[in-house]
């Protein structure tokens, strides 16, 4: 229960942090205009990966997308690839979950091929989380270092556009967007690892080897005592006597001259 | 059709006040910024400020902070301007102009109101 | 402030002749995000509230005659009206639409000789 329930929880967090990737990368807002102590401008610009946009102070907004490839700096084409790396892994990821699912039966599916798939769905999504967290960290140092830059023609990097002294860029909110969400795919994928050690049987079963002792008869099943995790009755870690099933505490409360060698 | 009807002549005292309004018609009020702008006999244009009654966003020129205040009735679709401290410097005629949707014009000025302070 | 200069004060004119009229400010009013010039030109003629002319400094307003022309960029903008009429005769202001406040030039009065 408590697999399924993590496993699930891991699964909507993922999912909640995918979208919140998707919303981020198609967001206009990852840098605005500084406003200084001013709250309220007749022209206000904003910059996302994909446009700039300019809102005056009637509400009427513009966008422009950056029709060119090749003149976009390196650094907003980087940040790009991360995202959308984030993006196809996430989604790679969460369609790779669905079937993983605990609680959805697909055909004879073993336990042990649903636990890869969640380790699978479980590591894209770690990596997705940090695509993301490392796209969104990677603008927002870009947008750091071009806040000082107060020359008459400051480039900012946004476009390739020449700036004047005046306009200066701030974290937008899709960088919050994008780290929260980011971390939010980060956890996710961890609940989903977290999950898969659950799922996956605790030890390879090997059929059981009869021991014959003088005056008992005892059936051994290998494998130990291992903790047991509290959840249900810990059946596999049970040693069986003939001539009644008793536990391991009753056969220790129970010493026979055979348990002395 | 845009409209924008403001209120008659002033005559004042210094040192007094004078509230007057601009009554807008044919737009949705609440959309618009309404600016205010003063013209002295045989000068300039000169911007006193703005307020946006949807939000009630107000912004003023430096030199009109303390000396007039912008309010808005958006029931009435009026706008209205309180000019306080009145000296004959502040004889002139008053404008209430709306922001336009591009550019950040002024589309339809009122006709405007005068204001003659002495004393 | 950005401060707008106008000149000249004052034109004097034959109808159908060309005019042009500058107007220039401290700042730049060229915004990069949309490339565009915040510069705005008004005519207002005498007893009149002032009326738009052109907007982004060089958009004609609906129902403004083609004779009217804005152009420039940055700091330095220009009026131009192709062939003067009689009903052209008024007082032309340039305001900074770009950053409040918003602040106007003092004027160019156009008159017929």
């Known amino acids: 229960m408590a697999v399924t329930a993590c496993q699930g929880l891991g699964f909507v967090v993922s999912l909640i942090g995918i979208a919140g990737i998707i919303a981020a990368t198609c967001m206009d807002q990852w840098s605005t205009q500084d406003l200084y102590n001013n709250p309220v401008t007749a022209v206000f610009n904003y910059q996302g990966l994909w446009r700039s946009c300019v809102r005056e102070s009637s509400g009427f907004t513009e966008c422009r997308g950056y029709f060119t490839l090749l003149g976009l700096p390196a650094m907003l084409q980087a940040v790009r690839a991360l995202m959308i790396v984030g993006i196809v892994l996430g989604a790679i990821g969460l369609l790779v979950s669905i079937f993983a699912l605990k609680c959805i039966r697909i055909g004879s599916m073993e336990d042990s091929a649903k636990a890869n798939m969640t380790l699978t769905s479980g590591i894209m999504f770690i990596v997705s989380g940090l695509c993301a967290i490392a796209g969104v960290s990677v603008f927002a140092n870009m947008l750091v270092t071009n806040f000082w830059m107060s020359t008459a023609n400051m480039y900012t990097g946004m476009g390739g556009m020449v700036q004047t002294v005046q306009t200066r860029y701030t974290f937008g909110a899709a960088l919050f967007v994008g780290w929260v969400a980011g971390g939010l795919t980060l956890i996710g994928g961890v609940m989903m690892c977290i999950a898969c050690r659950g799922l996956a049987p605790e030890e390879t079963n090997y059929k059981a080897v009869s021991y014959h002792a003088s005056g008992h008869s005892v059936a051994y099943k290998p494998g130990g005592f291992k903790a047991s995790t509290g959840f249900g009755s810990n059946t596999k870690n049970k040693k069986i006597y003939d001539g009644g099933a008793r536990t391991e505490d009753e056969v220790q409360s129970y010493p026979s001259k055979h348990d002395y060698v | 059709e845009v409209q924008l009807q403001q209120s008659g002549t002033v005559l004042a005292r210094p040192g007094t006040s004078v509230k007057m309004s601009c009554k807008a018609s044919g737009y949705r009020f609440t959309s618009s910024w309404m600016h205010w702008v003063k013209q002295r006999p045989g000068q300039g244009l000169e911007w006193i400020g703005a307020n946006y009654p949807g939000k009630s966003d107000t912004t003023y020129t430096q030199k009109f902070k303390g000396k007039a205040r912008l309010t808005a009735v958006t029931s009435a679709s009026t706008a209205y301007m309180e000019l306080s401290s009145l000296t004959n410097e502040d004889s002139a005629v008053y404008y209430c102009a709306r922001g336009a949707y591009y550019g950040n014009a002024m589309d339809y000025w009122g006709q405007g109101t005068s204001v003659t302070v002495s004393s | 402030d950005i401060v707008m200069t106008q000149s000249p004060s004052s034109l004097t004119v034959t109808a159908g002749e060309k005019v042009t009229m500058s107007c220039k400010s401290s700042?730049?009013?060229?915004?990069?995000?949309?490339?565009?010039?915040?510069l705005t030109w008004y005519q207002q003629k005498p007893g009149q509230p002032p009326k738009l002319l052109i907007y982004?400094?060089?958009t004609r307003e609906s129902g403004v005659p083609d004779r009217f022309t804005g152009s420039g960029s940055g700091t330095d903008f220009t009026l131009t009206i192709s062939s003067v009429q009689a009903e052209d005769l008024a007082v032309y202001s340039c305001q900074n639409a770009y950053s409040y406040p918003f602040t106007f030039g003092a004027g160019t009065k156009l008159e017929l000789k």
């Open positions: 700042q730049s009013l060229l915004n990069s995000g949309n490339q565009k010039n915040y």
């Open positions: 982004w400094a060089s």
